[in-house]
Amino acid sequence: EAHKSEIAHRFKDLGEQHFKGLVLIAFSQYLQKCPYEEHIKLVQEVTDFAKTCVADENAENCDKSIHTLFGDKLCAIPKLRDNYGELADCCAKQEPERNECFLQHKDDNPNLPPFQRPEAEAMCTSFQENPTSFLGHYLHEVARRHPYFYAPELLYYAEKYNEVLTQCCTESDKAACLTPKLDAVKEKALVAAVRQRMKCSSMQRFGERAFKAWAVARMSQRFPNAEFAEITKLATDVTKINKECCHGDLLECADDRAELAKYMCENQATISSKLQACCDKPVLQKSQCLAEIEHDNIPADLPSIAADFVEDKEVCKNYAEAKDVFLGTFLYEYSRRHPDYSVSLLLRLAKKYEATLEKCCAEGDPPACYGTVLAEFQPLVEEPKNLVKTNCELYEKLGEYGFQNAVLVRYTQKAPQVSTPTLVEAARNLGRVGTKCCTLPEAQRLPCVEDYLSAILNRLCVLHEKTPVSEKVTKCCSGSLVERRPCFSALTVDETYVPKEFKAETFTFHSDICTLPDKEKQIKKQTALAELVKHKPKATEDQLKTVMGDFAQFVDKCCKAADKDNCFATEGPNLVARSKEALA
């Protein structure tokens, strides 16, 4: 349905509060260096303009597209070129090229300091003084650091943030109340950020069809009682919504997401028996709840998948005449039977099935050729199952920090050319898979592990694409999205790598390490570990254990010393010498 004024339409649908939040997110994701004050000024101008269009849809400029209106606002910023360099060149283009240009300039790793949470008292004071401004800052700070964050979901996290502060700021021990609750929100939001980045990568690199296949598999797992036509409708809608958000159409994205939630709640009977609890919530919470919904129970009487996809005489005809429908149906049928598989695995199985038909159907006896296809899935299923088993066992043995270190060693050996901060970030995130997934029931482990790892590896790929340094990483990253994780898992020590020179200053530490929070301390140690591996890529596990054990003792000892600086200055060189010797 066409509207005279797109901006008026969105303002009316979303309401002022959500409209303003989304506009702020959009501007913060496009111009990541601008201060909050500058963006909020633009947001207010856009909001005022939207209100004039609501009052009169025929008012001047109200018929312009939202991209045109937003782009014009951004391009009017003084000193745009000084702050953003070549991004300013986008302003010479016309829509839709101008928006495409803005999207290409989004920086996945902006040069911004880590977001520091203020001290509890200070936080509560500024929240109570001006909740709107406080939450605005939150949206701005998250959005500029995560330029592909799913905007309606970020509004939901801001709402959660608001709830926590409202609740905790009245407590006597504000910090004790705030810290665990805000940590939980932060953890969920960070995972949401990498997951959404993966969705946008899928959309950007492989197009809508690839994303829709992902959505069909996911929806089929969640709603195994829904018909294929229903799953296709939901997958099509989800694809459209994600395309809009990934493309910077945040108002349309949020509006369509709310519409989808409404549709799902109106059609529970044909979708899932688990939706009711979500449908009683307000819009943001409703959409979030539906996105996280538990799987419905699998129908009891499902026939063997072989009947329609192996034994049927018309398999090849059905494949050749409508691959999208036939393979979509295969993916639907297989996925609804396997909530215990990762979406990545289901897509690999569908790809294998497609490749088998493509190879067999033109042959003299196709059924004889494709007859064993389901049995040929076995190795593809076993590989991630073994990955989960070995990694969860290692996690249980080492704990999160130790497991992160094991992953860090492994990945530094695979791709020693990658920068140490990137390797440390990736390994820390990959290492969290243990805490996140290994404690789950058996049936939930595989989907949790593999789909999480895929999202983290996508982040590694996105960062590596900016400054490619490792041929092996490039090779894994440029292949199909669903093959990335197996590709990285299969990488071995890079034999072409020339070890780094041993630099004493890399392993020189000072007393400032003692006052760092635990997380920062860990990062310092892990940075040293990655550098050690870069120096000695073939160091044994025992050698690395010895050196890192020595290092931990050294830090511990000097941080307890009366004269810390002196301890670090005298003991440090001894440690470096011992480490060199141990690795010789």
């Epitope: 050749a320 005449e321 409508a322 691959k323 033109a362 042959e363 196709p366």
Partner: antibody
């Protein structure tokens, strides 16, 4: 050496019929899919249809009904039966093998030299 | 309706030149089912590239293909005298019945 050789082309009146043959030598035809592709004078390529080794056929939407592909593996030959011919069917008709290992992809690695069909009164 | 648009329809170039031909498909081709053919006057087409970027054996490495989804490119890095010909892209879709060729690009001597 593998060869595909078309025959049966010539002059035919509008509304008439013609059967083209594609004789294959150097390989056992029973293992391969064969396509028919045509090219009007001075124009581009146009896919007509395919016959798989099993005998299953598929046609371009515009070709359904008037064109029929068949095969005789004992003679190592594929046929294209064309009915209700029109002036716009005037073209060089080629047979071409689909690259082994593919069934529906437009990858044709072996081609005949073509046979000219002229539809005119 | 399936549309396979090749551009330019003709290009004049000299030996040693780099030549780029593009092929735009609507909708997107199925699973990178895209091929490139070379045809010389009076001869049958010859398959150069399949799966958008894979070179058929015996085809010189100066030919390369790239792209995915809807936009594809054939590049001849350094044109040789034997490369003057007409080039066609071919696309496969969800239905085999939609198999289509582009309109062709004639590469002529400048």
């Amino acid at each position: 050496e593998v060869q595909l050789l078309e025959s049966g082309g010539g002059l035919v009146q509008p509304g008439g019929s013609l059967r083209l043959s594609c004789a294959v030598s150097g390989i056992d035809l029973s293992n391969y899919a064969i396509n028919w592709v045509r090219q009007a004078p001075g124009k581009g390529l146009e896919w007509i249809g395919i016959i798989w080794a099993s005998g299953t056929t598929f046609y371009a939407t515009w070709a359904k009904g008037r064109f029929t592909i068949s095969r005789d593996n004992s003679k190592n030959t594929v046929y294209l039966q064309m009915n209700s011919l029109r002036a716009e069917d005037t073209a060089v008709y080629y047979c071409a093998r689909t690259v082994p290992g593919y069934s529906t992809a437009p990858y044709f690695d072996l081609w005949g030299q073509g046979t000219l069909v002229t539809v005119s009164s | 309706d399936i549309q396979m648009t090749q551009s330019p329809s003709s290009v004049s170039a000299s030996v040693g030149d780099r030549v780029t031909i593009t092929c735009q498909s609507s909708p997107s081709v199925w699973s990178n089912f895209l091929s490139w053919y070379q045809q010389k006057p009076g001869k049958a087409p010859k398959l150069l590239i399949y799966e958008a970027s894979k070179l058929t054996s015996g085809v010189p490495s100066r030919f390369s293909g790239s792209g995915s989804g809807t936009d594809f490119t054939l590049t001849i890095s350094s044109l040789q005298p034997e490369d003057f010909a007409t080039y066609y892209c071919g696309g496969g879709y969800s239905s085999i019945s939609d198999t289509t060729f582009g309109g062709g690009t004639k590469v002529e001597i400048k």
